[in-house]
Interface confidence: low
């Protein structure tokens, strides 16, 4: 039975040209995290494997930095970075937990962080 929950940074916004940290946290389970995938809609951004460490997709290596922790830092943001991001926790023995973050990249200097929310 999957008892864990993923807490994410929820809906967030950031300025064009800036950086943002995408964070997910898995709680309420003793399952072992074997791998975390960070995905943007139809693209794999990065993998953090328990054995192999971080692997950043070649097409994003100039703008994506691993961490902090199991999070992901996006740099040199453009308006095209607006959209859904998924943290996918592969765990044993529970299986897969997925968290969703929506990022809006703003042209203006007004960028407020949204509220946190839970995904079961």
């Amino acid at each position: 039975m999957m008892t864990g929950t993923i807490e994410t940074t929820g809906n967030i916004s950031a300025e064009k040209g800036g950086s943002i940290i995408l964070q997910c946290h898995l709680s309420s389970t003793t399952a072992q995290v074997t791998q975390v995938n960070w995905e943007q809609q139809d693209q794999l951004l990065a993998i953090c494997n328990a054995d192999l460490g971080w692997h950043i997709s070649p097409s994003f290596k100039d703008r994506v930095a691993p961490g902090p922790g199991l999070g992901l830092t996006l740099q040199s943001l453009t308006v095209n970075d607006t959209g859904e991001y998924f943290c996918i926790y592969h765990t044993y023995p529970d299986g897969t937990y997925t968290g969703r973050i929506f990022l809006e990249v703003l042209e203006s200097s007004v960028a407020e962080h949204g509220a946190r929310f839970q995904i079961p």
């Epitope: 074997t34 791998q35 995938n37 995905e39 809609q41 139809d42 794999l44 993998i47 494997n49 054995d51 192999l52 692997h55 997709s57 998924f86 592969h90 044993y92 299986g95 897969t96």
Partner: antibody, heavy 116, light 110 residues
Framework: QVQLQESGPGLVKPSETLSLTCTVS????????MSWIRQPPGKGLEWIGI?????NTYYANWAKGRVTISKTSTTVELKLSSVTAADTAVYYC????????????WGQGTLVTVSS | DIQMTQSPSSLSASVGDRVTITCQAS??????LAWYQQKPGKAPKLLIY???TLASGVPSRFSGSGSGTDFTLTISSLQPEDFATYYC????????????FGQGTKVEIK
Amino acid sequence: QVQLQESGPGLVKPSETLSLTCTVSGFSLSSSYMSWIRQPPGKGLEWIGIIGSNGNTYYANWAKGRVTISKTSTTVELKLSSVTAADTAVYYCARGGYRTSGMDPWGQGTLVTVSS
Amino acid sequence: DIQMTQSPSSLSASVGDRVTITCQASQNIYSDLAWYQQKPGKAPKLLIYRASTLASGVPSRFSGSGSGTDFTLTISSLQPEDFATYYCQQEHLVAWIYNVFGQGTKVEIK
């Protein structure tokens, strides 16, 4: 009853784009990974790629730049561009393939021959 | 990239024999491994998933074991219908992979 059925032209000319459709029934694509696999005559299984429940796609290194996998509510489509005779194979679709319970079931496969 | 190496590539056996096929992953894939059986002109059929779980409808003479990098498919008593080609497949990683399948093991009649 879970069923998968591949369809598409059996003959494609060199340099053209191979297009295949996998029509599914008995389950929802919105909660399933779907894989494409091929098998050249007399050879082993070659993984082409996979599409996730949320539309994420992952392609084999050899196919990147040439392959596109997409889906609708009941179909999964494979497009392979700039084909050569080496792309002649039986093409299969299958449910699963990534952190799942294996690829099951498989379609019956469709033979695609690349020839002028 | 994760490479899957099966051995042997082919073997000859008789009905009633115990047959063992091995699959080695180039890195730790935990228990994310499946085994398939394929007969000529047919689509592959799932036998084992998560390294050791028997798929629905598969006879109990088939069994799988292993975790990490080394895996084994065993047929305890080979039957006439078991002569086929067997493939292993890693389900651990699909990013930056060349092929998720091993090269296959053909089981022939001695």
